[in-house]
């Protein structure tokens, strides 16, 4: 039995996968910040985790996925105010009793040092210095991501 948050996460991910493929993103859109091969949008307004997930989806993006500690640190360096928390795309899966990214993969326990409990209705936020488990209903800011497409030189056959 999936929780409502798990179901929402899966539904949104599936609907994103169904959408027609779009041309690759070569530059970050206005108001988005580039971090290596990603574009990040740090929200100004606040929302519970579910609404944040949905908002990123409508922006043709996803809640932030963090690959490793190095990416976490670089992302945290972009946060200007140490008191502000941002949702990322990681929440507790009750059925699998583990932290699960919205792309379906599980958290490698070495990647993030989470402060707080791993329990039902817990979602992960990051600040300038830490990673926290929060009630998913808490209204805080969030980070959306879009992947930049690497530029490859096209080879055209002789005409």
């Amino acid at each position: 039995q999936k929780s409502s948050i798990e179901k929402c996460s899966v539904d949104i991910q599936q609907s994103r996968n169904k959408t027609t493929e779009r041309p690759g993103l070569l530059n970050c859109p206005i108001y988005w910040q580039q971090l290596r091969e990603k574009c990040l949008l740090f929200s100004h307004t606040v929302n519970p985790w579910n609404n944040s997930l949905a908002d990123c989806s409508t922006k043709e993006s996803s809640l932030l996925l963090i690959r490793d500690k190095d990416e976490l640190i670089h992302t945290q360096n972009l946060i200007r105010d140490k008191a502000i928390l941002f949702w990322i795309g990681l929440n507790f899966s009750l059925s699998e009793k583990n932290w699960k990214w919205i792309n379906g993969s599980f958290l490698n326990s070495n990647d993030l040092e989470i402060r707080g409990d791993a329990k039902e209705n817990s979602c992960i936020s990051i600040s300038q210095t830490s990673v926290y488990s929060e009630y998913c209903s808490t209204e805080i800011r969030w980070i959306c991501q879009k992947e930049l497409t690497p530029v490859r030189n096209k080879v055209y056959p002789d005409s």
């Epitope: 108001y31 100004h44 307004t45 606040v46 609404n51 922006k59 105010d81 209204e139």
Partner: antibody, heavy 117, light 110 residues
Framework: QVQLQESGPGLVKPSETLSLTCTVS????????WSWIRQPAGKGLEWIGR???????NYNPSLKSRVTMSVDTSKKQFSLKLSSVTAADTAVYYC???????????WGQGTLVTVSS | QSALTQPPSASGSPGQSVTISCTGT?????????VSWYQQHPGKAPKLMIY???KRPSGVPDRFSGSKSGNTASLTVSGLQAEDEADYYC??????????FGGGTKLTVL
């Protein structure tokens, strides 16, 4: 270039509902939030509220009980309904793009709505 | 009454600098770096001049600059020109996803 166009009745009777629609052209509706702002003649601006294209919204607390906003992404339109209007609701109503929920970078030209019997 | 306080009028001669203030509280201007400024000519829609306290959208002359100290934000127009004569409104994000405006300042170029 993003363009916004407000449309709706210019005259509404007291106690009735004011209804306006904003049509977005020249850009995506899905990547942004969208706000309504009004300005009584000779006075300052007042933020009415915003709608997210996910459907959720935020309203000015002073107007919240009377405001409803909706969005139709397929038509690239968003709408405002303000119920139980009085003469104090007479104003120029603007729609605006609200990219991050904290400022307005594109505005419609505004439409005057008069509340009078 | 507006949530943010602006002087009703300001003036300066061509080439001079003029600064317009916008005072709020710790729940709006003081609490967030999300102050914006708008220019409005008579009968026209407002135009974004400054956002996030000091950022200028493309197309806005660098004569326009913004700053903030505590609960007060400021817009400075340097090298004043005749076309700068307009009403100027400040705005700020406020607690729990609200936006508030100032009452507006009429800038006159003498």
């Amino acid at each position: 270039q993003v363009q916004l166009q407000e449309s709706g009745p210019g005259l509404v009777k007291p106690s009735e509902t004011l209804s306006l629609t904003c049509t977005v052209s020249g850009g995506s509706i899905s990547n942004y939030y969208w706000s309504w702002i009004r300005q009584p003649a000779g006075k300052g601006l007042e933020w009415i509220g915003r709608i997210y294209t996910s459907g959720s919204n935020n309203y000015n607390p002073s107007l919240k009980s009377r405001v409803t906003m909706s969005v139709d992404t397929s038509k690239k339109q968003f709408s405002l309904k303000l119920s139980s209007v009085t003469a104090a609701d007479t104003a120029v109503y603007y729609c605006a793009r609200d990219p991050l929920g904290t400022f307005f970078d594109y505005w419609g030209q505004g439409t005057l709505v008069t509340v009078s019997s | 009454q507006s949530a943010l306080t602006q002087p009703p009028s300001a003036s300066g001669s061509p080439g001079q600098s003029v600064t317009i203030s916008c005072t709020g509280t710790s729940s709006d201007v003081g609490g967030y770096n999300y102050v914006s400024w708008y220019q409005q000519h008579p009968g026209k829609a407002p135009k974004l001049m400054i956002y996030e306290v000091s950022k200028r959208p493309s197309g806005v002359p660098d004569r326009f600059s913004g700053s903030k100290s505590g609960n007060t934000a400021s817009l400075t127009v340097s090298g004043l020109q005749a076309e700068d004569e307009a009403d100027y409104y400040c705005s700020s994000y406020a607690d729990t996803n609200n936006v508030v405006f100032g009452g507006g300042t009429k800038l006159t170029v003498l």
